[in-house]
C-alpha cells in the first residue's frame, strides 16, 4: 500500500509534469504559428521591396535612356544655328579647336579630318594675331597646316597653297631633312619647323556656319 | 503487486511521454531560434532594400529634373542664334573666355563684368573635367570665381553660394591669412588657393544664349 | 609614396623650448600645407596650425599664439614646429600631417615637459 | 570657433554588427567634414572627407552621411581590425577643431 501510494504520488506529478509540458508545446506551437506567420509577412514585404526596387531600376534607365536622348537631340539641334559645335572658338569666318591630345603632325591631321575639319592655316595677319593671343597663355607647341617634302621643296599648306613670306619667319630647322617630313609649329607666337614625327598638340581649324540663321 | 504493476507500467508510459514531450519542446525551441535568426535576416535585408529603393528615387528624382531641365532647353533651342560671341568656347549651358592678359583676382573680375560675365564657376564634375581639359595645354595659374575673406570664413562663389567640398580638393596656402583675402586658381587641372593680390589669367563664364529667336 | 618622417622624442624642462621637424617625401612640398596636430596623454586630437611650404606663411591657433612659430626649409623639403615656454600640460605627442583634409600624417613626436 | 560633438563616447560590439557614430557641429558646416580612424600608438588615418567621399584604400564598409550640422559615420559589417578610436573633424574654417573621440571596442 506504501508503495501503491508512492507510485501514485509520483504517477500524479508524471500526468502533472505532462500536462504541463502538453501546455508549452501548445504555446510554442502558437507562438511558431504566430513567428511563421510573421516570417510570412517580412518574405512578402522582401518580395515587394525587391519589385519595386527592380521596377525603379527599370524606370530609372529609361529616364536615362530619355536624358541621353534629349542631349543629343539638344547638340544636334543647337549645333543647327551654332556658328561652330560646342567645344570649339568661333573667330571672324572660322572655328578653331586647340586639341588637348599630343600627337605627330600626321595623326594630328586625321585628328582633325576626323572632325570634318583640317590643320590651321594662317591666311593673313589678322588670323596670326588670333592665334598668337589664343595661345598665349600656352608654352607648348601646336602642330600647323604647314609642311613641306624637304627643303628643296616649298612650304605648302594642306590645300595646296603655298606660304606667302609676309606672314611670318621661320625659325628652328628650316634647312634640315627629314625622312617624314619638315612641319611647321607654333609656340608663344613664333612659328618653328620641325620633324614632322615629334608629337605636338595641334589646332583644327573650319569654316563656321554663318548662313543666316 | 497487480495494482503495483499497472501502475508502474502507467509510470513509464508517463516517463516515456514526458520525455517525448522534452525532446519536442528542445526540437521546437531550436527551431524558435533558428526562426528568430532567420527574422533577423528578414529584417536586415528589408532595411536594406528599403534603403536602396529610397538612393533609386533619390537618383530617379534627379534624373527627372535633368531630363525636365533638358527638355525646357530644346524647347528653348529651336531657331537659335550664335550661342556664344566671337573668341569664347561654347559647353554645353555656358560659353567660356580664357583672358589672354594677367591680372590679380578683383581686376580679372571687372574684365568679366565688363564682358557680361562672372569669373568661372565649377557646379559639377562634368563642369570640372572641361576646364582640365581646355586648361590641359597650359602649365600657367587661371583664377576662378572662388574666394574667402580669411579662413575663418567658407569659400563662397561670386553668387554668394558656397562650395561644396566633394567637387575638389584646394592645394596651396588654404590656412593662410592675406590682407586682400584668398583667392582659388586651377593650374595643370588642380584649384589651389592663393593670395588675391596676385596676378594670373584668368576663365569668363557666361550663359550661352540658347533663347528661341 | 607620400611620407612624412618626424624627429625623435624629446624630454623638455618647463620654460624650455621644442623643435620638432616633419621631413616630406614623395610629392611637390610647396604645394600642400604642413599641419600640426597635437595629442595629449589619452586626450583626442588639437589642431595647431598650418603652413604653406610655398609661400612661407604661418596659421596659428589662437591659444598657441605667441608661443608656436612654424616654419620650413623647402631646399630639404622639411617643415618645423617649434613651441617656446614649455608647461607640464603641453606633454602630449606632436603629430605633422598633409593638406586638408589630412591625407599622410607623420608617424608622432613624443615631447615630455618634466622637471 | 565650431564644436564638435560626438557620441557616443565608447561604443561596444560585436564582430559582424553594424556600428553608427554621429558628430554634431554648433553650426552648419556644409558637409566639411572628415572621420579619422586611430590605434593606440599610431597616427589618424583618413576614412572619409566631404561627409560621404572614402579614401582611396579605405574599405567599403565604412560610409558616411549626414548634411548641415549632423553627420553620421557607419561600419556596415565590424571586423576585428576596425576596433579604434574615431574622430570627426570640421575644416571648413578655422580652426579646424575635432570631436572628443568614440572609442570603438569588441564585446
Known amino acids: 500500500s506504501q508503495v501503491s501510494n508512492l507510485l501514485k504520488q509520483q504517477q500524479t506529478n508524471l500526468t502533472h509534469q505532462k500536462n504541463k509540458l502538453e501546455g508549452q508545446i501548445s504555446a510554442r506551437q502558437q507562438a511558431e504559428e504566430a513567428s511563421q506567420e510573421s516570417q510570412n509577412e517580412l518574405k512578402e514585404m522582401i518580395e515587394t521591396l525587391a519589385w519595386k526596387l527592380n521596377e525603379k531600376s527599370k524606370e530609372q534607365m529609361e529616364l536615362h535612356h530619355q536624358n541621353l536622348n534629349l542631349q543629343e537631340t539638344l547638340k544636334r539641334v543647337a549645333n543647327c544655328s551654332a556658328p561652330c559645335p560646342q567645344d570649339w572658338i568661333w573667330h571672324e569666318e572660322n572655328c578653331y579647336l586647340f586639341s588637348t591630345g599630343s600627337f605627330n603632325w600626321e595623326k594630328s591631321q586625321e585628328k582633325c579630318l576626323s572632325l570634318d575639319a583640317k590643320l590651321l592655316k594662317i591666311n593673313s595677319t589678322a588670323d596670326l594675331d588670333f592665334i598668337q593671343q589664343a595661345i598665349s597663355y600656352s608654352s607648348f607647341p601646336f602642330w600647323m597646316g604647314l609642311s613641306r617634302r624637304n627643303p628643296s621643296y616649298p612650304w605648302l599648306w594642306e590645300d595646296g597653297s603655298p606660304l606667302m613670306p609676309h606672314l611670318f619667319r621661320i625659325r628652328g630647322a628650316v634647312s634640315q631633312t627629314y625622312p617624314s617630313g619638315t612641319c611647321a609649329y607654333i609656340q608663344r607666337g613664333a612659328v618653328y619647323a620641325e620633324n614632322c614625327i615629334l608629337a605636338a598638340f595641334s589646332i583644327c581649324q573650319k569654316k563656321a556656319n554663318l548662313r543666316a540663321q | 503487486s497487480q495494482v503495483s504493476n499497472l501502475l508502474k507500467q502507467q509510470q513509464t508510459n508517463l516517463t516515456h511521454q514526458k520525455n517525448k514531450l522534452e525532446g519536442q519542446i528542445s526540437a521546437r525551441q531550436q527551431a524558435e531560434e533558428a526562426s528568430q535568426e532567420s527574422q533577423n535576416e528578414l529584417k536586415e535585408m528589408i532595411e536594406t532594400l528599403a534603403w536602396k529603393l529610397n538612393e533609386k528615387s533619390k537618383e530617379q528624382m534627379e534624373l527627372h529634373h535633368q531630363n525636365l531641365n533638358l527638355q525646357e532647353t530644346l524647347k528653348r533651342v529651336a531657331n537659335c542664334s550664335a550661342p556664344c560671341p566671337q573668341d569664347w568656347i561654347w559647353h554645353e549651358e555656358n560659353c567660356y573666355l580664357f583672358s589672354t592678359g594677367s591680372f590679380n583676382w578683383e581686376k580679372s573680375q571687372e574684365k568679366c563684368l565688363s564682358l557680361d560675365a562672372k569669373l568661372l564657376k565649377i557646379n559639377s564634375t562634368a563642369d570640372l573635367d572641361f576646364i582640365q581639359q581646355a586648361i590641359s595645354y597650359s602649365s600657367f595659374p587661371f583664377w576662378m570665381g572662388l574666394s574667402r575673406r580669411n579662413p575663418s570664413y567658407p569659400w563662397l562663389w561670386e553668387d554668394g553660394s558656397p562650395l561644396m567640398p566633394h567637387l575638389f580638393r584646394i592645394r596651396g596656402a588654404v590656412s593662410q591669412t592675406y590682407p586682400s583675402g584668398t583667392c582659388a586658381y586651377i593650374q595643370r587641372g588642380a584649384v589651389y588657393a592663393e593670395n588675391c593680390i596676385l596676378a594670373a589669367f584668368s576663365i569668363c563664364q557666361k550663359k550661352a544664349n540658347l533663347r528661341a529667336q | 609614396q607620400v611620407q612624412l618622417v618626424q624627429s625623435g622624442a624629446e624630454v623638455k624642462k618647463p620654460g624650455a623650448s621644442v623643435k620638432v621637424s616633419c621631413k616630406a617625401s614623395g610629392y611637390t612640398f610647396t604645394d600642400y600645407e604642413v599641419h600640426w596636430v597635437r595629442q595629449a596623454p589619452g586626450q583626442g586630437l588639437e589642431w595647431m596650425g598650418a603652413?604653406?611650404?610655398?609661400?612661407?606663411?604661418?596659421a596659428y591657433v589662437q591659444k598657441f599664439q605667441g608661443r608656436v612659430t612654424m616654419t620650413r626649409d623647402t631646399s630639404i623639403s622639411t617643415a618645423y614646429m617649434e613651441l617656446s615656454r614649455l608647461r607640464s600640460d603641453d606633454t602630449a605627442v606632436y603629430y605633422c600631417?598633409?593638406?586638408?583634409?589630412?591625407?599622410?600624417w607623420g608617424q608622432g613626436t613624443l615631447v615630455t615637459v618634466s622637471s | 570657433d565650431i564644436q564638435m560633438t560626438q557620441s557616443p563616447s565608447s561604443v561596444s560590439a560585436s564582430v559582424g554588427d553594424r556600428v553608427t557614430i554621429t558628430c554634431r557641429a554648433s553650426?552648419?558646416?556644409?558637409?566639411?567634414l572628415v572621420w579619422y580612424q586611430q590605434k593606440p600608438g599610431k597616427a589618424p588615418k583618413l576614412l572619409l572627407y566631404a561627409a560621404s567621399r572614402l579614401e582611396s584604400g579605405v574599405p567599403s564598409r565604412f560610409s558616411g552621411s549626414g548634411s548641415g550640422t549632423d553627420y553620421t559615420l557607419t561600419i556596415s559589417s565590424l571586423q576585428p581590425e576596425d576596433i579604434a578610436t574615431y574622430y570627426c573633424?570640421?575644416?571648413?574654417?578655422?580652426?579646424?577643431?575635432f570631436g572628443q573621440g568614440t572609442k570603438l571596442e569588441i564585446k
Open positions: 553650426q552648419g558646416i556644409n558637409n566639411w
Open positions: 603652413i604653406h611650404p610655398g609661400s612661407g606663411g604661418a
Open positions: 573633424q570640421q575644416y571648413l574654417i578655422t580652426p579646424y577643431t
Open positions: 600631417a598633409r593638406w586638408l583634409p589630412m591625407d599622410y
